[in-house]
């Protein structure tokens, strides 16, 4: 079906990956579709096969080069097409002129580690992955801590309005198991969104010393 509601959304990870999701109400699940990328000022083009992620939604990753290579800049425009096979020919189902640095979503932060832990506080660091050098220090972070008996959705968000790849969590309970996550977002880009949350880092605060107030 071509008359259902259709949405074609893509994000650039700032280095060498464009991730796309296409949804089409009424489209057949077994339809063979792909995303084609055609830059306006580069000699390469790239294709990826859309794979189903839900009843009416497909996704794929355009791998533009080595993970840390800078394949696009702020002046690039990439024409992105969804093409679906109909019999012996391909039909264009969706199209957009994609401005990479207006549609950023970075990779989740990696290498989370506990730098120092005490009874009431914990210092945690992390690294950003595959982030363009163009950003310099123009990044922000959000972090959250999972306390016992709560859900991630209930966890208050801690905002770091600068490129700070560490945090000191305070007012923690002694001898308690916690989990910690962080995500990153460039300040640039009209349609830029937060990265996925990092893998959770589990840690335990130290027990209070015997005979001392906690």
């Amino acid at each position: 079906a071509v008359n259902g509601t259709s949405q074609f959304t893509c994000f650039y990870n700032s280095r060498a990956n464009i991730s796309c999701v296409w949804s089409q109400d009424g489209a057949l699940q077994d339809t063979s579709c792909q995303v084609h990328a055609w830059p306006d000022r580069r000699r390469w083009n790239q294709t990826c096969e859309l794979l189903p992620v839900s009843q009416a939604s497909w996704a794929c990753n355009l791998i533009l080069g080595a993970p840390d290579s800078q394949k696009l800049t702020t002046v690039d425009i990439v024409t992105l097409r969804v093409l679906c096979r109909e019999g012996v020919r391909w039909r264009v189902m969706a199209i957009q002129d994609f401005k990479p640095f207006e549609n950023l979503r970075l990779m989740a932060p990696i290498s989370l580690q506990v730098v120092h832990v005490e009874t009431h506080r914990c210092n945690i660091s992390w690294e950003i992955s595959q982030a363009s050098h163009y950003f310099e220090r123009h990044l922000e972070f959000e972090a959250r801590t999972l306390s016992p008996g709560h859900t991630w959705e209930e966890a208050p968000l801690l905002t770091l309005k600068q490129k700070q790849e560490w945090i000191c969590l305070e007012t923690l309970t002694p001898d308690t198991q916690y989990e910690f996550q962080v995500r990153v977002k460039p300040l640039q880009g009209e349609f830029t969104t937060w990265s996925p949350w990092s893998q959770p880092l589990a840690f335990r605060t130290k027990p209070a010393a015997l005979g001392k107030d906690t």
Partner: nanobody
Framework: QVQLVESGGGLVQAGGSLRLSCAAS????????MGWFRQAPGKEREFVAA????????VYVDSVKGRFTISRDNAKNTVYLQMNTLKPEDTAVYYC???????????????????WGQGTQVTVSS
């Protein structure tokens, strides 16, 4: 499938004007962008102009900017190409095309369009 019928072509002197029309029938509910292409003898078919479903976005090949105007009447399922200040190099068969593709680009190609008319001849004499 969508059926397209062009009209309005003909022989005109350089500097003159023509207005091409293209009437769509069939599965017109599936039409999004409508466009015009042209093909001169011995040359590849080239993009001329396109207009979005709502009519609020248009794009033209550089060589016709300021001379050609694309418009559409959704109630009549018709797209028009007003061609002014015609030049001998505008001589070609002009084709109307439609696409079901959702979205917009400034870089339309023949592959983006799935329904085509038979074409109408435009000849500009010097």
């Amino acid at each position: 499938q969508v059926q397209l019928v062009e009209s309005g072509g003909g022989l005109v002197q350089a500097g003159g004007s023509l207005r091409l029309s293209c009437a769509a029938s069939g599965r017109t509910f599936s039409i999004n962008t409508m466009g015009w292409f042209r093909q001169a003898p011995g040359k590849e078919r080239e993009f001329v102009a396109a207009i979005s479903r709502s009519g609020d976005s248009t794009v033209y090949v550089d060589s016709v900017k300021g001379r050609f105007t694309i418009s559409r009447d959704n109630a009549k399922n018709t797209v028009y190409l007003q061609m002014n200040t015609l030049k001998p190099e505008d001589t070609a068969v002009y084709y109307c095309a439609t696409t079901v593709a959702v979205g917009w680009t400034t870089r339309w190609s023949t592959i983006d369009f799935d329904s085509w008319g038979q074409g109408t001849q435009v000849t500009v004499s010097s």
